[in-house]
C-alpha cells in the first residue's frame, strides 16, 4: 500500500513538474509576445504620428498657397480695377506701401524738409500721413524706426492744421511734454512750424527745412 | 573709449580712385550717422558726406557729388568714402566724424585725419 | 546754402580775458549750431551744440548764445590752453556748412 501511494505521489511530482515548465514556456512566450506587440503597437503609433505631422505640413504649406493665391487673385483684379478706374481713389494698395485700415502708407527711407515731403505725397496721389487714432499712431511708430519723422501737421498758416483738412482740436494729439512751443529763436520768421514723430513716437514741433524722414499716407477706396 | 581711426591716403594722380577707412570702436556703431570732413592745407573745415545710421540715407557736398560715394559696413564697424576722378582740389585732410544722432544732429567725435595729396 | 560768416577772422587776447566770437548766417537755422575747436596740426574738438548746450568734458567757461541768425561763442577767461582756432558750424540742413573760421593769438 506504501509502496503504491509513494509511485502515485511520484507520477504526481512527475506531472506537476511538467505541468510547471510547459506553463512557465507558454508564459515566456505571451510575454515575448506581449512585447513584441508592444513594439508594433509603438511603431505604429510613430508611423501615425509622422503621417499626422507630415498631413499637418501639408496642410500648412496648402493653406499658405491659397492665401497667397488669394492674396495674388485680390491684387491682380484690384490693378486690373485701377486699369479701368479714374485714378482719384486707390482701389488696392501700391508695391512697397503698407495697408491699414482703408489706408496705404509710404515710409521714407531718406531725409527731407517738410515741404519737400509734402510735395513727394502730393506727386504720389497722396498726403503727409495724418494721425486719427491710437491704434493707427501704434502702426506708424512700427514701421518708422526709430527717427524722427514728419507728419501731415503744421502751423505754418496759424493754428494747427492736418494736411487732409482733419479738424485738430477734436482729433488724436500725442505731443512730448511741453510740446508744441513754437519755438521762434531761429529767426526764420516764425515759431517751429511743422510737427514730426520723435524717436519714441511722440509728437514734437519743429524747423520745416530739418530733413527728417516722412510717411505718405492715400485712402484705398473702401467697395473693394 | 570712443575712438575715430582714418586710413588710406596717399599721393595719387589727378583723375584716380583712392579709397579711405575709418574704423570705429568704443561706440554702438550701427546708431550713429558719420561724416566725412575735409581740410585743405591752410584753409577752414568743408564738410564732404553724411550717411545715416543704417545707410539709408546718403548726402555730399555740391563739390564731390557724382564723384565721391560714402558707405559703411555695421558689422565691421567701419565707415567709408570711394574718392573717384579725384582733382588737385580735392588736396586735404580728411577726417571722419560721428553725428551725435541718426544722421542729422551735428559733428561731436573726430578721428585724427588722413592726408590725401592730389598731384601730377 | 547757407552762407556762415565769422568775425573777427583772428584776435589777440591775453591770458584771463574775456573773447567773444560771433557767427552770422545767412538764413534762420534754429538752434541747430556747433562750435568746434582746433589746434594746429590737430583735428577740430566738439565745443557745444544747439547753440549753449555743452559737450561733455568740455569747461564752463565755454559759453553760446544767440538766435535767428545771429550767435556767439564765448571763453569767459582765456588761458594758455585756450589759444586755438574756433570755428561754428549749422547743421539745420544738408549740405552742412562752416564758418571761415577765428583765430585767437596770444596777445
Known amino acids: 500500500q506504501n509502496s503504491k501511494l509513494r509511485g502515485e505521489l511520484q507520477a504526481l511530482r512527475e506531472t506537476f513538474s511538467n505541468f510547471t515548465a510547459s506553463t512557465e514556456v507558454e508564459v515566456k512566450a505571451l510575454s515575448s509576445q506581449g512585447g513584441n506587440v508592444g513594439r508594433k503597437m509603438k511603431s505604429l503609433e510613430s508611423q501615425l504620428e509622422k503621417q499626422q505631422k507630415d498631413l499637418s505640413e501639408d496642410h500648412s504649406d496648402l493653406l499658405l498657397h491659397v492665401k497667397q493665391f488669394v492674396s495674388d487673385l485680390r491684387s491682380l483684379s484690384c490693378q486690373i480695377a485701377a486699369l479701368h478706374g479714374n485714378g482719384s481713389t486707390l482701389t488696392c494698395c501700391p508695391v512697397n506701401w503698407l495697408e491699414y485700415e482703408g489706408s496705404c502708407y509710404w515710409f521714407s527711407r531718406s531725409g527731407k524738409s517738410w515741404p519737400e515731403a509734402d510735395k513727394y505725397c502730393q506727386l504720389e496721389s497722396a498726403h503727409l500721413v495724418v494721425v486719427n487714432s491710437r491704434e493707427e499712431q501704434k502702426f506708424i511708430q512700427h514701421h518708422m524706426g526709430p527717427v524722427n519723422t514728419w507728419m501731415g501737421l503744421t502751423d505754418q498758416s496759424g493754428p494747427w492744421k492736418w494736411v487732409d483738412g482733419t479738424d485738430y482740436e477734436t482729433g488724436f494729439k500725442n505731443w512730448r511734454p511741453e510740446q508744441p512751443d513754437d519755438w521762434y529763436g531761429h529767426g526764420l520768421g516764425g515759431g517751429e512750424d511743422c510737427a514730426h514723430f520723435t524717436d519714441d513716437g511722440r509728437w514734437n514741433d519743429d524747423v520745416c527745412q530739418r530733413p527728417y524722414r516722412w510717411v505718405c499716407e492715400a485712402a484705398r477706396d473702401p467697395a473693394t | 573709449q570712443v575712438q575715430l581711426v582714418e586710413s588710406g591716403g596717399g599721393v595719387v594722380q589727378p583723375g584716380r580712385s583712392l579709397r579711405l577707412s575709418c574704423a570705429a570702436s568704443g561706440f554702438t556703431f550701427s546708431s550713429y550717422g558719420m561724416h566725412w570732413v575735409r581740410q585743405a592745407p591752410g584753409k577752414g573745415l568743408e564738410w564732404v558726406a553724411v550717411i545715416w545710421y543704417d545707410g539709408s540715407n546718403k548726402n555730399y557736398a555740391d563739390s564731390v557729388k557724382g564723384r565721391f560715394t560714402i558707405s559703411r559696413d555695421n558689422s565691421k564697424n567701419t565707415l567709408y568714402l570711394q574718392m573717384n576722378s579725384l582733382r588737385a582740389e580735392d588736396t586735404a585732410v580728411y577726417y571722419c566724424?560721428?553725428?551725435?544722432?541718426?544722421?542729422?544732429?551735428?559733428?561731436?567725435?573726430w578721428g585724427q585725419g588722413t592726408t590725401v595729396t592730389v598731384s601730377s | 546754402d547757407i552762407q556762415m560768416t565769422q568775425s573777427p577772422s583772428s584776435l589777440s587776447a591775453s591770458v584771463g580775458d574775456r573773447v567773444t566770437i560771433t557767427c552770422r548766417t545767412s538764413q534762420g537755422i534754429g538752434k541747430y549750431l556747433a562750435w568746434f575747436q582746433q589746434k594746429p596740426g590737430k583735428a577740430p574738438k566738439s565745443l557745444l551744440y544747439?547753440?549753449?548746450s555743452l559737450q561733455s568734458g568740455v569747461p564752463s567757461k565755454f559759453s553760446g548764445s544767440g538766435s535767428g541768425t545771429d550767435f556767439t561763442l564765448t571763453i569767459s577767461s582765456l588761458q594758455p590752453e585756450d589759444f586755438a582756432t574756433y570755428y561754428c558750424q549749422q547743421y539745420m540742413t544738408y549740405p552742412l556748412t562752416f564758418g571761415g573760421g577765428t583765430k585767437v593769438e596770444i596777445k
Open positions: 544747439k547753440v549753449s
Open positions: 566724424a560721428r553725428d551725435q544722432g541718426v544722421g542729422y544732429d551735428g559733428l561731436d567725435v
